[in-house]
């Protein structure tokens, strides 16, 4: 049985040319994280593998670097960031977990962190 | 140089057993998932089983499922195949294959052939 | 299970053409798709993995994309040592299926 939740920044913005940083964390479960997938809508953006350590996407790599963590951070921003990301958690014995974050990249300097919520 | 060498293939009979090896040479064996993935004579590429870097989790096609037990020794940089109640339709040249991430196959060995014939 | 289905299976094209390949995957898959050349008697080679990423050492006239359930292999210009079968793969949830391979013959 499946115990653990994801818990994410939920919805955040940034300011273009700015970085985010994307946080999820895994709680309520003894599983063992194996491996951390990190997706932006269909698109493969990084992964932390317990045993072989982050693996960026090579058309990423000049934007996205890893952590903090088993987070990831993505710099010099731009409007065409906006969307979803998805932190997934591949457990040992629990299975995959999956967080959702929404980010907006605004073109001002009105940006503001949103609230954490969580997702079982 | 990472390197995948099959071993233990041959000619069986239905119903019979066989096992096969793989040795893993050129990077660190214990931290890679690993899969066996055969291919029928003339035929495309059908994948077989799987086992994560310590072992803790497998997989099997529905084909193989109940027949076939993959297995690691970490200690000996090995992978196995065991093949039981082996039919006519196994026969292929089975590989092995690092799977780093739990994603794509970067290395895949040689292979080694089995023929289950009466 | 997930189907994946690749046309053409096979094609007939001269050295210097631009060749493509898809394949389709029966439910969406994300960005889990990868690509592979067999050469006859060889084991398989990885050309591109998660759907557009060139695997080390994999000459820069081959390229992926795609993202769901549609995916694509494009060579730009066929080269004599591209003349192989290939295979797309999905690693989205086993078990692992492969397309039925595409064949690139000499015209």
């Known amino acids: 049985m499946m115990t653990g939740t994801i818990e994410t920044t939920g919805n955040i913005s940034a300011e273009k040319g700015g970085s985010i940083i994307l946080q999820c964390h895994l709680s309520s479960t003894t599983a063992q994280v194996t491996q951390v997938n990190w997706e932006q809508q269909d698109q493969l953006l990084a992964i932390c593998n317990a045993d072989l350590g982050w693996h960026i996407s090579p058309s990423f790599k000049d934007r996205v670097a890893p952590g903090p963590g088993l987070g990831l951070t993505l710099q010099s921003l731009t409007v065409n960031d906006t969307g979803e990301y998805f932190c997934i958690y591949h457990t040992y014995p629990d299975g995959t977990y999956t967080g959702r974050i929404f980010l907006e990249v605004l073109e001002s300097s009105v940006a503001e962190h949103g609230a954490r919520f969580q997702i079982p | 140089e990472v390197q995948l060498l099959e071993s233990g293939g041959g000619l069986v009979q239905p119903g019979g057993s066989l096992r096969l090896s793989c040795a893993a040479s050129?990077?660190?064996?214990?931290?890679?998932?690993m899969h066996w993935v055969r291919q029928a004579p003339g035929k495309g590429l059908e994948w077989v089983a799987s086992?994560?870097?310590?072992?803790?989790?497998?997989g099997y096609a529905d084909s193989v499922k109940g027949r076939f037990t993959i297995s690691r020794d970490n200690s000996k940089n090995t992978l196995y195949l065991q093949m039981n109640s082996l039919r006519a339709e196994d026969t292929a040249v089975y590989y092995c294959?690092?799977?780093?991430?739990?994603?794509?196959?970067?290395?895949w060995g040689q292979g080694t052939l089995v023929t289950v014939s009466s | 299970d997930i189907q994946m289905t690749q046309s053409p299976s096979s094609l007939s094209a001269s050295v210097g053409d631009r060749v493509t390949i898809t394949c389709r995957a029966s439910?969406?898959?994300?960005?889990?798709l990868n690509w592979y050349q067999q050469k006859p008697g060889k084991a398989p080679k990885l050309l591109i993995y998660?759907?557009?990423s060139l695997q080390s050492g994999v000459p820069s006239r081959f390229s992926g994309s795609g993202s769901g359930t549609d995916f694509t292999l494009t060579i730009s210009s066929l080269q004599p040592e591209d003349f192989a079968t290939y295979y797309c793969?999905?690693?989205?949830?086993?078990?692992?299926?492969f397309g039925g391979g595409t064949k690139v013959e000499i015209k």
């Open positions: 294959a690092r799977v780093p991430y739990d994603y794509w196959i970067d290395y």
């Open positions: 050129g990077f660190t064996f214990s931290s890679y998932s």
């Open positions: 086992i994560s870097s310590n072992a803790g989790t497998t």
């Open positions: 439910q969406s898959i994300s960005s889990y």
């Open positions: 998660a759907a557009s």
């Open positions: 793969q999905q690693s989205y949830s086993t078990p692992l299926t």
